[in-house]
């Protein structure tokens, strides 16, 4: 049966993003419509047809355009994605003979981790803090020279859609740690990044 091939995309906040649909059919469509899926009913964004060309709805005028003007292959591009653009989008190919054939492509917005790593001595212990803020929520791990060191983790969600994960490493005998390297590992979207800190006695 006739189908539409799509691919989900994950792009960085405030960068361009493109979503593509391909009608697997011998014949082109008469008109292509892109809609954003919403809880109640889909919202029309843009249409393309031979009759009327590209027609962008006012709410999307400065946000998107159709960058592949096809009636079999259609691509929309967001110039500068925001968190509001995250979601799923439907492309509808209105075909002669077989009506509306649709596909769905989803856009996920990510924010690269911003990491801070610092330490603080108290009289009898050492606290090393690693904080990572990203979207989706990052994970924070420690690599330390010896085992048995406790840590505590706090997660905080921000209104802008990012999440901060703060992990504090509690070292009871700080003298043994002086001159040694501690590594904070941040896992985000399948990639682990090491942040190294050597403890010096201040």
């Amino acid at each position: 049966q006739v189908q539409v091939v799509t691919q989900d995309e994950r792009e960085q906040l405030y960068t361009p993003a493109s979503l593509k649909c391909s009608l697997q059919n011998a014949q082109e469509a008469l008109i292509v419509t892109w809609q954003k899926k919403k809880a109640v009913s889909p919202e029309n964004m843009v249409t393309f047809s031979e009759n009327h060309g590209v027609v962008i709805q006012p709410a999307y005028k400065d946000k998107i355009n159709i960058t592949q003007l096809g009636l079999q292959n259609s691509t929309i591009t967001f110039w500068n994605i925001t968190l509001e653009d995250e979601g799923c989008y439907m492309c509808l190919f209105n075909t002669f003979g077989f009506g509306k054939i649709s596909g769905t492509a989803c856009l996920t917005v990510y924010v690269q981790p911003i990491v801070s790593l610092h330490y603080k001595f108290s009289e009898d212990h050492l606290n090393i803090t690693c904080s990572a803020t990203a979207r989706p929520a990052p994970m924070v791990f420690w690599k330390v020279p010896r085992s048995g060191i406790e840590n505590s983790t706090v997660t905080l969600s921000h209104p802008n859609g990012t999440t901060s994960v703060t992990s504090i490493l509690h070292i009871k005998d700080p003298k043994n740690q002086v001159g040694k390297e501690v590594i904070c590992q941040v896992l985000h979207l399948g990639t682990v990044t090491d942040f190294k800190q050597t403890v010096n006695k201040g």
Epitope: V2, N25, A26, Q27, A29, L30, N51, F96, G97
Partner: antibody, heavy 117, light 107 residues
Framework: QVQLVQSGAEVKKPGASVKVSCKAS????????ILWVRQAPGQRLEWMGH????????NYNLKFKGRVTITRDTSASTAYMELSSLRSEDTAVYYC??????????WGQGTLVTVSS | DIQMTQSPSSLSASVGDRVTITCKAS??????LSWFQQKPGKAPKSLIY???RLVDGVPSRFSGSGSGTDYTLTISSLQPEDFATYYC?????????FGQGTKLEIK
Amino acid sequence: QVQLVQSGAEVKKPGASVKVSCKASGYSFTDYIILWVRQAPGQRLEWMGHIDPYYGSSNYNLKFKGRVTITRDTSASTAYMELSSLRSEDTAVYYCGRSKRDYFDYWGQGTLVTVSS
Amino acid sequence: DIQMTQSPSSLSASVGDRVTITCKASQDINSYLSWFQQKPGKAPKSLIYRANRLVDGVPSRFSGSGSGTDYTLTISSLQPEDFATYYCLQYDEFPYTFGQGTKLEIK
């Protein structure tokens, strides 16, 4: 040159089935939809259904309540329209045509199907 | 189903006349309308598609217009070979439906 050649006239009894063929030549068969329309004596044209030979997907006018089946044989570049449970009001000339999207350009010569007891 | 109503049902005209045939849909068909010419014992011949686009090889005296529910076929100057029956077809919604036809006869 492009041609759609239909099978010959048929006389059928009520309750029987008829299968009309439409042989395409002069173009790539899978690039165009094949459609079927009919015209009873003194009546308007009536769209029966169509097939996309590329996939074999078809769409039928529900008026025919499952009596119509449109198929194709890509190796023979031929489309078929079968109408079952024939009744006298199915007496008509049956035409196949081809379309690229909504651009209709070639038609078969028509096949007269007479349903009579 | 969408109903297509053509008017007039028949029309007498002379060679050289300007003739207009109209087709009214029971709902908006988004300009998805074709016009066909049919002569007795012959297959229909496509003249216009998508309301106003002329099919290749069709003389420029034929033109189509309209939008929404109301559509028109105009023959600017009738020729002897134009006397035939004309049908409109909507293909906005399945099942696709034809008008009842307009028979154009020589006066």
